[in-house]
């Protein structure tokens, strides 16, 4: 029987700046039952602040809801393990709202072959950005990532949209089904999960030609 | 309606004790910090008292410390101030206030009235 | 312990003039800085954190402003309904130190 192991705070995600949470990785638990609390204060400040709220994060998590989240602030938190046998901590880790957000994928992915009588055809893809992200605020800059594939291939094609939320592709295989996705991330942040995907059937008549 | 209630003043002697009480209502008690500010009559305000959410951790204004202890009990939703060694100076209207997320006093009770005299 | 000095402690002034508090710290607080209204009789209110965020349903005529060790609450039009003493308070590390107050009157 031994003092828990140390822990490590891996990761803190934010999906659009007015929340987050954080997670840690428990050391060894020295063979009895062992204890999680997170600590934390700001920058600048040495109140000592315990974490709110541990379940909605999920296992080994630190929830910040809206109202213990801040932007302007840098946030120094570590977690200590304790059991009967005594205590470690983990390192401190200091974590900057604004660099954590992950935002939730790209909503309403719409994609639609046009077919112009006057100009080459083309793929048309929509989407919207996701739902907890107010863009209006000017907090945010969202860019975008598109990738499609036929169906059977192996290899994704990616295009880069930047902040636009449609984009045109004209070089597609005719009489291929095309999966198409689309994910985003803020100017400082992480990119989203990709969204679900969306099937398109290339006619065989559309033309690659000039 | 978020709510704080205070009850337990009274008037002491010196060197008395008195035990303060606050319930909450309207919020999740236990993801809150609670603290103890006093003001004396015609004074200003002075925080006495801090406590985390579960209560691990306190901090006290120097002139109490030793004196007063600080509590909670979260199934309670009640936070307490345990006063001893009462003196003179300790007369004021008590109140408990929730810090909120950014650590700043959002709400506030009425007061509890302490009178400590001979 | 970082001290908290307010000024002037009493001021009178007619209704529409501008009024300025000052709130100094002894030491830099950042901007971990709350305001708060206490008017006679009554419980204090929260009017600004943060030094310059105006809590919500807190009338546009208060302000604040300031960082490090100097910072002001500033009314640009005094109202009847602001007689009250104003305080400032630190939240950067205990003591919560709360400054002496500024009683506002009307002239």
């Known amino acids: 029987q031994l003092p828990p192991g140390k822990p490590e705070i891996f990761k803190c995600r934010s999906p659009n700046k007015e929340t987050f949470t954080c997670w840690w990785r428990p050391g060894t638990d020295g063979g009895l039952p062992t204890n999680y609390s997170l600590t934390y204060h700001r920058e600048g400040e040495t109140l000592m602040h315990e974490c709110p709220d541990y379940i909605t994060g999920g296992p080994n998590s630190c929830h910040f809801g809206k109202q213990y989240t801040s932007m302007w602030r840098t946030y120094i938190m570590m977690v200590n393990a304790t059991n009967q046998m005594g205590s470690s901590f983990s390192d401190e880790l200091y974590v900057d709202v604004t660099y954590i957000v992950q935002p939730d994928p790209p909503l309403e992915l719409a994609v639609e072959v046009k077919q112009p009588e006057d100009r080459k055809p083309y793929l048309w893809i929509k989407w919207s950005p996701p739902t907890l992200i107010d863009l209006k605020t000017g907090w945010f800059t969202l860019l975008y990532e598109i990738r499609l594939k036929p169906e059977k291939a192996a290899e994704w094609e990616i295009h880069f949209a930047g902040q636009q939320t449609e984009f045109k592709i004209l070089s597609l295989h005719p009489g291929q089904k095309y999966l198409v996705q689309v994910r985003c991330k803020p100017d400082h942040g992480y990119w989203s999960a990709w969204s679900p995907a969306t099937f398109i059937q290339i006619p065989s008549d559309f033309t690659m030609n000039d | 309606e978020v709510q704080l209630v205070e009850s337990g003043g009274d008037l002491v002697q010196p060197g008395e004790s008195l035990r303060l009480s606050c319930t909450a209502s309207?919020?999740?008690?236990?993801?809150?910090?609670m603290n103890w500010v006093r003001q004396a009559p015609g004074k200003g305000l002075e925080w006495v008292s801090y406590?985390?959410?579960?209560?691990?951790?306190?901090y006290y204004v120097d002139s109490v410390k030793g004196r007063f202890t600080i509590s909670r009990d979260n199934a309670k939703k009640s936070l307490y101030l345990q006063m001893n060694s009462l003196r003179a100076d300790d007369t004021a209207l008590y109140y408990c206030?929730?810090?909120?997320?950014?650590?700043?006093?959002?709400?506030w009770g009425q007061g509890t009235m302490v009178t400590v005299s001979s | 312990d970082i001290q908290m000095t307010q000024s002037p402690s009493s001021l009178s002034a007619s209704v529409g003039d501008r009024v300025t508090i000052t709130c100094r710290a002894s030491q830099d607080i950042f901007n971990y800085l709350a305001w708060f209204q206490q008017k006679p009789g009554k419980v204090p209110e929260l009017l600004i954190s943060?030094?310059?965020t105006l809590q919500s349903g807190v009338p546009s005529r208060f302000s604040g402003s300031g960082s490090g060790t100097y910072f002001t609450l500033t009314i640009s039009s005094l109202q009847p309904e602001d007689i009250a003493t104003y305080y400032c308070q630190r939240y950067n590390s205990a003591p919560l130190t709360f400054g002496g107050g500024t009683k506002v009157e009307i002239k």
């Open positions: 206030a929730r810090l909120n997320g950014v650590d700043v006093f959002d709400i």
């Open positions: 309207g919020f999740t008690f236990n993801s809150y910090e």
């Open positions: 943060a030094a310059s």
């Open positions: 406590i985390s959410s579960s209560g691990g951790t306190k």
